[in-house]
């Protein structure tokens, strides 16, 4: 089980590092988006895992951004960002096989309404129970 957890962590960390770099190979990314969305978590250890991903990064002082699958829908009533940005992206999470282009990548400020827990604990708990 420890070996399985290590392997899972390695796969997830690699998926995060390479997020958005190959529009033709997005199955792992979209699967991870789905995990974050379903488990209500963000990143492996912490949301900060995403800050090294250049394609998500904002300019200058607004650098810290995470994928929209980290967005906590229940914590906001900001209908503009929900209707225009988040919901169209999250509706795609059920269609994991669809190819995606880098222009489609949806990111939100990490200081806004996001899940602040990393996914490691939730996934480890799930592994222990199965």
């Amino acid at each position: 089980r420890a070996q399985l957890e290590r392997s899972l962590r390695d796969v997830v960390e690699k998926t995060i590092q390479k997020y958005g770099t190959n529009p033709e190979e997005t199955a792992a990314e979209e699967s991870w988006d789905y995990v974050q969305f379903q488990l209500r978590c963000c990143g492996w250890h912490y949301p900060q895992d995403w800050f090294q991903v250049l394609i998500l990064r904002g300019n200058g002082s607004e650098a810290h951004r995470v994928p929209c699958s980290c967005y906590n829908l229940s914590a906001t009533n900001d209908s503009t960002i929900l209707d225009k940005v988040i919901l169209p992206q999250l509706s795609r999470l059920g269609h994991l096989a669809r190819s995606r282009h880098s222009a489609d990548i949806c990111a939100v400020p990490a200081e806004s309404h996001i899940y602040r827990e990393g996914c490691a604990q939730g996934l480890q708990k799930w592994l222990h129970n199965n």
């Epitope: 912490y46 200081e111 806004s112 602040r116």
Partner: antibody, heavy 115, light 107 residues
Framework: QVQVQESGPGLVAPSQTLSITCTVS????????VSWVRQPPGKGLEWLGV???????NYHPSLKSRLSIKKDHSKSQVFLKLNSLTAADTATYYC?????????WGQGTLVTVSS | DIQMTQSPSSLSVSVGERVTITCRAS??????LAWYQQKPGKSPKLLVN???NLADGVPSRFSGSGSGTDYSLKINSLQPEDFGTYYC?????????FGQGTKLEIK
């Protein structure tokens, strides 16, 4: 443009509670974190805590039991409360826009704890 | 608590010279590091975030580098306005800490 300004009491008696207000403009408290940092006279910077866009908070472990950070979106204000003050809490207190890196700082308010 | 150790604690350098300030974290902080400059009696100013990303309006003579536990801030050709105290700050985990500061004086 972004502006951040602290207002505090200046002098507080030992064992009392410190209350500082941070008034912001040029950005939304719903999408940005606001952090608090203090600096004792002649010393370095100490991170106190942050309040995120969703209202959740992170606190310095050793101050957790004494520190509270809240905000009022309608007034664009963030509030710091630190109780059971001692002379060691004498410092300039800063609030800053940003939860991770701190991009815009207020001018700071000097708080002296003394009877 | 992650500890941040800066070195040197102070240095005196001539205008035009190159300066390197280093910051070591007590554990891997995965590039979640910022650098600030503070002048006497003033508030700190953000220079760099995510270890290498220059903040808005910061001159290109400043650059950040590093990964894992070891990070550095370089000033390529020191200008008179670059004097002050420099601080690193990590933001990995759920609580952040600053380094103790490096005081840079112009020779």
């Amino acid at each position: 443009q972004v502006q951040v300004q602290e207002s505090g009491p200046g002098l507080v008696a030992p064992s009392q509670t410190l209350s500082i207000t941070c008034t912001v403009s040029g950005f939304s408290l719903t999408t940005s974190g606001v952090s608090w940092v203090r600096q004792p006279p002649g010393k370095g910077l100490e991170w106190l805590g942050v309040i995120w866009g969703d209202g959740s908070t992170n606190y310095h472990p050793s101050l957790k039991s004494r520190l509270s950070i809240k905000k009022d979106h309608s007034k664009s204000q963030v509030f710091l409360k630190l109780n059971s003050l001692t002379a060691a809490d004498t410092a300039t207190y800063y609030c800053a826009k940003g939860g991770y890196s701190l991009a815009h700082w207020g001018q700071g308010t000097l708080v002296t704890v003394s009877s | 608590d992650i500890q941040m150790t800066q070195s040197p604690s102070s240095l005196s350098v001539s205008v035009g010279e190159r300066v390197t300030i280093t910051c070591r974290a007590s554990e891997n902080i995965r590039s979640n590091l910022a650098w600030y400059q503070q002048k006497p009696g003033k508030s700190p100013k953000l220079l760099v975030n995510v270890a290498t990303n220059l903040a808005d309006g910061v001159p290109s003579r400043f650059s950040g580098s590093g990964s894992g536990t070891d990070y550095s801030l370089k000033i390529n050709s020191l200008q008179p306005e670059d004097f002050g105290t420099y601080y690193c700050q990590h933001y990995w985990g759920t609580t952040w800490t600053f380094g103790q500061g490096t005081k840079l004086e112009i020779k």
